[in-house]
Amino acid sequence: TPEVWVQVQMEATELSSFTVHCGFLGPGSISLVTVSWGGPDGAGGTKLAVLHPELGTRQWAPARQARWETQSSISLALEDSGASSPFANTTFCCKFASFPEGSWESCGSLPPSSDPGLSAPPTPVPILRAD
């Protein structure tokens, strides 16, 4: 069964600098990745970035840089807002559209007790959506 993992990382050197890492564990080929915050894409969440494996990226504030890390994982660096831990209680969701599996989405956040520099454990909440 395909699975999506999400990790939210706070940089040890800059407490207001966050990166979201997402990956797809499954046999299919990824056709699109959508990263949102505040909830799943299309279900109250706000789109932060869209990544296509061939055609590139589109992103919106506070996204600073969305990139592919591997063929099945992406990272999204978030703007430094100047506030301390501005995204500490925020939920980030990643939706992977793949063929032939359909769409799989998981959400994660940085636990309040997380030490700087540590990642939140993967918190997959798979949502199967037929394309």
């Epitope: 061939e54 055609l55 590139g56 919106w60």
Partner: antibody, heavy 119, light 107 residues
């Protein structure tokens, strides 16, 4: 016919601000992002930033953060770009362009607005 | 930032000839490259997207090719109306960046 009609030329003084517009017609305004580009005289194009008319979300080239502010008025299907603290370096032609999110390219470009900064 | 290099600022050709305009990316951008045509005093217009797909209404004498870092816009049977400047654009990573442009001159 899809069109992006931009406001007319502007002659402005150094240190001042200017707000230029891009009025869309011929399509559903909120279905497409609008991006802005700068073309200085005799040089190439630079991407300034993008605006989603649907929710007002923006994205900026770091180089233009603090220089350009993108806004939108859905009721008039118009996107705006304000440029502030103008210097001679900001003298250029500015274009808005529609981003086709299905095919991933700028399929329609605006008519262009010439901004001249001079005392 | 990704640098898009169009090494030839000017290219001279004759009506009926074939010309190839090149664009090189400073890092791999897959097929996230478009080509735009700008005639003197006009706004840019879309020619090619996704490295090789022609925009609606673009004559089939315009062909885009390449992937990764090296891209080419080829114009077969050049016409006088092709007198223009041609820009490549990458949208693989932010900020999006354009090539410096290649001006096509007709002899």
């Amino acid at each position: 016919e899809v069109q992006l009609q931009q406001s007319g030329p502007e002659l402005v003084k150094p240190g001042s601000s200017v707000k230029i517009s891009c009025k869309a017609s011929g399509y559903t305004f909120t279905d497409y992002n609008l991006d802005w580009m700068k073309q200085s005289h005799g040089s190439s194009l630079e991407w300034i930033g993008a605006m989603s008319p649907n929710n007002g979300a923006t994205s900026y080239n770091q180089k233009f953060k603090g220089k350009a502010t993108l806004t939108v008025d859905k009721s008039s299907s118009t996107a705006y770009m304000e440029l502030r603290s103008l210097t001679s370096e900001d003298s250029a032609v500015y274009y808005c362009a529609r981003w086709d999110s299905n095919s991933w390219y700028f399929d329609v470009w605006g008519t262009g607005t010439t901004v001249t900064v001079s005392s | 930032d990704i640098v898009m290099t169009q090494s030839q600022k000017f290219m001279s050709t004759s009506v009926g000839d074939r010309v190839s305009i090149t664009c090189k990316a400073s890092q791999i951008v897959r097929t996230a490259v478009d080509w735009y045509q700008q005639k003197s005093g006009q706004s840019p217009k879309a020619l090619i997207y996704s490295a090789s797909t022609r925009h609606t209404g673009v004559p089939d004498r315009f062909t885009g090719s390449g992937s990764g870092t090296d891209f080419t816009l080829t114009i077969d049977n050049v016409q006088s109306e092709d007198l223009a400047e041609y820009f490549c654009l990458q949208h693989w990573n932010y900020p999006y960046t354009f090539g410096g442009g290649t001006k096509l001159e007709i002899k």
